[in-house]
């Protein structure tokens, strides 16, 4: 068990252009309050689920009236911390939603009017017992600065508040199997407190309040032995000396939870985890309307005027989900062409282009050869965002500035001698071989292995192939 604590430091206009209008005016004075909702885990579905870890509402802040003509300053805040007690272990990873609400104090008929000013959400890792973590979140033109921490309530300790500490009974050491509670060396780890009535012989727990059964035992308190033989044979009324297991329909078969709720089995019944906007045993009741501001990230809410009708969020570009809570990975569509690097900046996409390409999506192929010369008669060839020179014979290198040694690769076969020539190379063949690279043997009967001689030449004539 423990408490999650949230301290709001400031709420006001964020940096950059487009400062928001003050939420209050001389005609309509108002005051702020905050709501925090916590959910375990880092799952994408977090925004859809109820505040399973808990929720809290702050006190109302001081009444604020806008000074005419003045920009909206940081608004006056409620005093104190928002505290969300948690009964079980602290999960270590959690999702949060912090809402800033405005309470208008004008002459409303029927009391004050409330409206949602801003909502921020995030996912974080946090160990219980650690220092305050600072955070800044933006919602539209507003900026919220806050700190948070999770702390264990005695006797719980540890990063998950699952270890329990008790003052030492003996001055020198802790009981068998129990360690000192660092940093409280004068205290000892206490055994976990399982669910009341959990069998000490056949049950155990890994978290306070649970009761898990050892093999061969069953029941909510692990007091019923599992019988492999029949336990329904006639043996007098209502005997309970052995438990038995019988097959049957699953409690969640056919999913009893409506409106997309997820069902989980419990020993005596089932439980529905309802999506945002629904509640009730089977998630059959819709309780959220557009007045509750259910759409995240600037989504437009439509419908939901009466409590029984659902609402629909029309999401701005870059967001999706029934509450616009999921950011679309727009780079996954690979909008940047020609190998450009995609950057999703939230408000816009940017493509960082490779050399030789330009345009919002790197769609323009620049003239790679513009202003680039190839030396010694070489010609420039465009391609792939870089220029390449096709060099004249006898030259090489990126710009054809290097004189090539045509004999370096030993092109003459069968012991032929290579000579560099202004127009290439010449092979002087060893006896018995012929051809431009001395690749063909001359047969003893005077016929060569040449498949066919070029017109005007007889096989066996001395020749030079360039």
């Amino acid at each position: 068990a423990g408490v999650f604590e949230l301290q709001i430091h400031s709420f006001g206009p964020g940096p950059g252009p487009g400062a928001p209008r003050s939420p209050c005016s001389a005609r309509l004075p108002c005051r702020l309050f905050f709501r925090v909702c916590l959910k375990p885990g880092l799952s994408e579905e977090a925004a859809e689920s109820p505040c399973a870890l808990g929720a809290a509402l702050s006190a109302r802040g001081p009444v604020y009236t806008e000074q005419p003509g003045a920009p909206a300053p940081d608004l006056p805040l409620p005093d104190g911390l928002l505290q969300v007690p948690f009964r079980d272990a602290w999960p270590g990873t959690f999702s949060f939603i912090i809402e800033t609400w405005r309470e208008e104090l004008g002459d409303q008929i029927g009391g004050p009017a409330w409206s949602l000013l801003a909502r921020v959400a995030g996912r974080r890792r946090l160990a219980a017992g650690g220092p305050w973590a600072r955070d800044i979140q933006r919602a539209g033109a507003w900026e919220l600065r806050f700190s948070y921490r999770a702390r264990c309530e005695p006797p719980a300790v540890g990063t998950a508040c699952t270890r329990l500490c008790r003052p030492r009974s003996a001055p020198s050491r802790c009981g068998p199997g129990l360690r000192p509670c660092a940093p409280l060396e004068d205290e000892c780890e206490a055994p976990l407190v399982c669910r009341a009535g959990c069998s000490p012989e056949h049950g155990f727990c890994e978290q306070p309040g649970e009761c898990r059964c050892l093999e061969g035992w069953t029941g909510p308190l692990c007091t019923v032995p599992v019988s492999t033989s029949s336990c329904l044979s006639p043996r007098g009324p209502s005997s309970a000396t052995t438990g038995c297991l019988v097959p049957g329909p699953g409690p969640c078969d056919g999913n009893p939870c409506a409106n997309g709720g997820s069902c989980s089995e419990t020993p005596r019944s089932f439980e529905c985890t309802c999506p945002r906007g629904f509640y009730g045993l089977r998630c059959e009741v819709s309780g959220v309307t557009c007045a509750d501001g259910p759409c995240f990230n600037g989504g437009l809410c439509v419908g939901g005027a009466d409590p029984d009708s659902a609402y629909i969020c029309h999401c701005p570009p870059g967001f999706q989900g029934s509450n616009c809570e999921k950011r679309v990975d727009r780079c996954s569509l690979q909008p940047c062409r020609n190998g450009g690097l995609c950057l999703d900046l939230g408000h816009a996409l940017r493509c960082r282009c490779r050399a030789g390409f330009a345009g919002p999506r790197c769609e323009h192929d620049l003239d790679d050869c513009a202003g680039r010369a190839c030396a010694n008669g070489g010609t420039c060839v465009e391609g792939g965002g870089a220029h390449r020179c096709s060099c004249a014979l006898g030259f090489g290198g990126r710009d054809c500035r290097e004189r090539a040694d045509p004999c370096a690769a030993r092109p003459c076969a069968h012991g032929g001698r290579c000579y560099a020539h202004f127009s290439g190379l010449v092979c002087a063949c060893a006896p018995g071989y012929m051809g431009a690279r001395c690749e063909f043997p001359v047969h003893p009967d005077g016929a060569s292995a040449l498949p066919a001689a070029p017109p005007g030449l007889r096989p066996g004539d001395p020749q030079r192939y360039l």
Epitope: T218, G219, P220, V224, V226, C231, L232, S238, S239, A240, G243, C244, L245, V246, P247, G248, P249, G250, P251, D253, P256, E265, T266, P267, R268, S269, F270, L281
Partner: nanobody, 126 residues
Framework: EVQLVESGGGLVQPGGSLRLSCAAS????????IGWVRRAPGKGEELVAR????????RYADSVKGRFTISADTSKNTAYLQMNSLRAEDTAVYYC???????????????????SGQGTLVTVSS
């Protein structure tokens, strides 16, 4: 002392109906789930119907779905099983049992029974 007493069994023709009753004492049925388990000759036990009296939620085995209806009257601490369109294969001893979900194993959901009655015989025959 916990007690469950079944009644209402008997001989019935195929297509006929019977209503079984289960009177509970020694505990409050609204705090538990109650099921009807049957054992047919030469077969194992099977939980055919189950009710959570707190919310009236019911589950049925596929073999009886649409023909059997389980209900409970918490003011009388009694559960009922209305059996319609009975078939020869429904012939079995029917036990009222206090049950809770145990878990899923080898392709089946299992329920633990901690108390059951002495059973009532239902025979479907022409």
């Amino acid at each position: 002392e916990v007690q469950l007493v079944e009644s209402g069994g008997g001989l019935v023709q195929p297509g006929g109906s019977l209503r079984l009753s289960c009177a509970a004492s020694g505990f409050n049925i609204s705090e538990h789930s109650i099921g009807w388990v049957r054992r047919a000759p030469g077969k194992g036990e099977e939980l055919v119907a189950r009710i959570y009296p707190t919310n009236g939620y019911t589950r049925y085995a596929d073999s009886v779905k649409g023909r059997f209806t389980i209900s409970a009257d918490t003011s009388k601490n009694t559960a009922y099983l209305q059996m319609n369109s009975l078939r020869a294969e429904d012939t079995a001893v029917y036990y009222c049992a206090r049950s809770y979900y145990h878990g899923y194993s080898h392709g089946h959901h299992y329920y633990a029974i901690d108390y059951s009655g002495q059973g009532t015989l239902v025979t479907v025959s022409s």
